[in-house]
Interface confidence: medium
């Protein structure tokens, strides 16, 4: 499987309270059942979304509501392939306090494109 | 057209067992979760728990962990939930849920959510 | 276990505002939902995180978010809004989801 994050720069930079969306794009997998881990834990969420892009292209998002500092670390994707588990390039989220200018270089892979979860 | 077809009612005496299932059809089945909501007559709804069926990872609520089961069988696009035994209490409506998207026109894709028309379980002796 | 808090009924006149409130100590994190349930009927979503108005739901059904609490407003109620209405989010560690106890409301 071909598996790499989209649309998200190896460090991420937001201010407090604000929301951030991770995109993970896998492809060369059928149906892959896409995880997200932080320092290494899978990420709970209930309403994991996945969007085919097409059969072998699939989009998984991780969605945090209102950043704190207990959110900041370091974010993957993996994935299952033939009793492997195969991981993306990571994701260093960092904070800035409420109010400041972060430097922020998060681009969506569909930036359009609005995609329910419960973090905010 | 996305449906969610779901078993008919069922009358159980206490102690029985029962399976009733959500089937899914109109979208990949495996693309999102499906969850089960119980609500008791007149009363409010409930989450039990749900499945992402491309991997049968499931999470349930406190409430309901132990006492039931959610399954999901790919090949006929449909989800279970099965009782090993039935309580009066369990006297309730069950609906399944699942989310998708659709894109009319544009490039955004809408979010919603489908609900299964309900199966009445009746547990009496 | 986690708990979300509504009140049990809200009454307006039509064409008045009505606010349904949902309280949960982890709503600083996690978005709220809102179903409207009318008698005999299964629930239709209405509002989805916090603040996005679910297709086909007129623009009188607004939702807003701030703290621990989650709102549903409708602005000039009618009539045929009277229906219960359910908050709905997860737990803060993501494990499981909730919903309110319910509002009843009522469009005299």
């Known amino acids: 499987a071909g598996l790499k994050l989209m649309g998200a720069p190896v460090k991420l930079t937001v201010s407090q309270g604000q929301p951030v969306k991770l995109n993970c794009s896998v492809e060369g997998m059928e149906e892959p059942d896409i995880q997200w881990v932080k320092d290494g834990a899978v990420v709970q969420n209930l309403d994991q979304l996945y969007i085919p892009v097409s059969e072998q292209h699939w989009i998984g998002f991780l969605s945090l509501k209102s950043v704190e500092r207990s959110d900041a670390g370091r974010y993957w994707c993996q994935v299952e392939d033939g009793g492997e588990t195969e991981i993306s390039q990571p994701v260093w989220l960092t904070l800035v306090p409420r109010g400041s200018s972060a430097h922020h270089h998060h681009h969506h892979h569909h930036s359009a494109w609005s995609h329910p979860q419960f973090e905010k | 057209e996305v449906q969610l077809v779901q078993s008919g009612a069922d009358v159980k005496k206490p102690g029985a067992s029962l399976t009733i299932s959500c089937q899914a059809s109109?979208?990949?089945?495996?693309?999102?979760?499906i969850s089960w909501v119980r609500q008791k007559p007149g009363k409010g709804l409930e989450w039990m728990g749900q499945?992402?069926?491309?991997?049968?990872?499931?999470n349930y609520g406190p409430s309901f962990q132990g006492h039931v089961t959610i399954s999901a069988d790919r090949s006929t696009a449909t989800a279970y939930l099965q009782w090993r035994s039935l309580e009066a209490s369990d006297t309730a409506m069950y609906y399944c849920v699942r989310p998708y998207f659709q894109t009319s026109g544009g490039t955004i894709p809408e979010y919603y959510q489908h609900w299964g028309p309900g199966t009445l379980v009746t547990v009496s002796s | 276990s986690y708990e979300l808090t509504q009140p049990p009924s809200v009454s307006v006149s039509p064409g008045q505002t009505a606010r349904i409130t949902c309280s949960g100590d982890?709503?600083?994190?996690?978005?709220a939902y809102w179903y409207q349930q009318k008698s005999g009927q299964a629930p239709v979503l209405v509002i989805y995180?916090?603040?996005k108005r679910a297709s086909g739901i007129p623009e009188r059904f607004s939702g807003s978010s701030s703290g621990t609490m989650a709102t549903l407003t409708i602005s000039g109620a009618q009539v045929e809004d009277e229906a219960d209405y359910y908050c709905?989010?997860?737990?803060?560690?993501?494990?499981?989801?909730?919903f309110g106890g319910g509002t009843k409301l009522t469009v005299l």
């Open positions: 499945i992402v069926p491309r991997a049968s990872r499931t």
């Open positions: 709905y989010s997860q737990e803060r560690n993501g494990n499981y989801a909730v």
């Open positions: 995180e916090d603040e």
């Open positions: 109109g979208y990949t089945f495996t693309d999102y979760w």
């Open positions: 982890a709503l600083p994190k996690k978005y």
